[in-house]
Amino acid sequence: ARARNGDHCPLGPGRCCRLHTVRASLEDLGWADWVLSPREVQVTMCIGACPSQFRAANMHAQIKTSLHRLKPDTVPAPCCVPASYNPMVLIQKTDTGVSLQTYDDLLAKDCHCI
């Protein structure tokens, strides 16, 4: 049996694991001293609940949900985490000037529960 990736949130619209965007400045992120650009980042992250088998990433997540139903004070419910990422290029300050650096795991592209 494979993991069931239910995409209907049983808690109601917008309450389950989903992609969320937060606008943040370099100062907000604590990057102002080493990043030149962009001055503002649209940070995409995974936020929300993981009830039942909602967006279960794999069989492990499915098992975790079942065990959570048996002993919820010991086995936590699955967590909402990125399933994949979008790359982002930052212009960084260096000792000799600036450099372009690509970060492959900075922005969430989509989310699942694990």
């Epitope: 069931r4 239910g6 949130c9 049983p10 808690l11 109601g12 309450r15 609940a49 009830p51 039942s52 088998q53 079942s66 959570h68 139903r69 048996l70 002993k71 919820p72 004070d73 010991t74 936590p76 419910a77």
Partner: antibody, heavy 120, light 106 residues
Framework: EVQLQQSGPELEKPGASVKISCKAS????????MNWVKQSNGKSLEWIGN????????SYNQKFKGKATLTVDKSSSTAYMQLKSLTSEDSAVYYC?????????????WGQGTLVTVSA | QIVLSQSPAILSASPGEKVTMTCRAS?????MHWYQQKPGSSPKPWIY???NLASGVPARFSGSGSGTSYSLTISRVEAEDAATYYC?????????FGAGTKLELK
């Protein structure tokens, strides 16, 4: 406002079966496990088991396996518990109860209870 | 299964008195939850995750403990506190309740 409305009292003969209901309102029914708890004669509480209304998965206290069967009807936001092969030991008040959070381990909401009396 | 032993079974107190009831688990549990029940009524959530008061519970109540020993304390008992208090664990399957402590007022 979250409400759990249970069906009325039942008087059954030994050996019979009974099915009691718990109608949920004021929240998304499929998002929270529904639990059932037994209280005999004003004594302590016993957890019978629970059901995930979204997928129908169940977990039972070993003591009540074969005695209780939990089901749901998503269309009417109603949970059911059937008790079979009734004996005097099954005479009790039965509660449905819902956790405070979808991942909670304590019951924030309780039905008013259904009294089941087994008597010849 | 984890057995929860509550003591005392019956606790008699005068208004204004400080009282403590205990719940001992046969094995370590991560949290303890407490309910209040009055005759003819459903149990009410009272304290969850060891020390958090449920909605509407007066601040004179508090909970504490860890491992196998937990307690519920009322700093100054009032008449409306007369009830039976049950502890509950769900660190292991099956979920279990204690036998209850009945608080009576003198």
């Amino acid at each position: 406002e979250v409400q759990l409305q249970q069906s009325g009292p039942e008087l059954e003969k030994p050996g019979a079966s009974v099915k009691i209901s718990c109608k949920a309102s004021g929240y998304s029914f499929t998002g929270y496990n529904m639990n059932w708890v037994k209280q005999s004669n004003g004594k302590s509480l016993e957890w019978i088991g629970n059901i995930d209304p979204y997928y129908g998965g169940t977990s039972y206290n070993q003591k009540f396996k074969g005695k209780a069967t939990l089901t749901v009807d998503k269309s009417s936001s109603t949970a059911y518990m059937q008790l079979k092969s009734l004996t005097s030991e099954d005479s009790a008040v039965y509660y449905c109860a819902r956790p405070g959070r979808y991942d909670g381990a304590w019951f924030a909401y309780w039905g008013q209870g259904t009294l089941v009396t087994v008597s010849a | 299964q984890i057995v929860l032993s509550q003591s005392p079974a019956i606790l008699s107190a005068s208004p204004g008195e400080k009282v403590t009831m205990t719940c001992r688990a046969s094995s370590n549990v991560n949290y303890m939850h407490w309910y209040q029940q009055k005759p003819g009524s459903s149990p009410k959530p009272w304290i969850y995750a060891t020390s958090n008061l449920a909605s509407g519970v007066p601040a004179r109540f508090s909970g504490s403990g860890s491992g196998t020993s937990y307690s519920l304390t009322i700093s100054r008992v009032e008449a409306e506190d007369a009830a039976t208090y049950y502890c509950q664990q769900w660190s292991d399957n099956p979920l279990t309740f204690g036998a209850g402590t009945k608080l009576e007022l003198k």
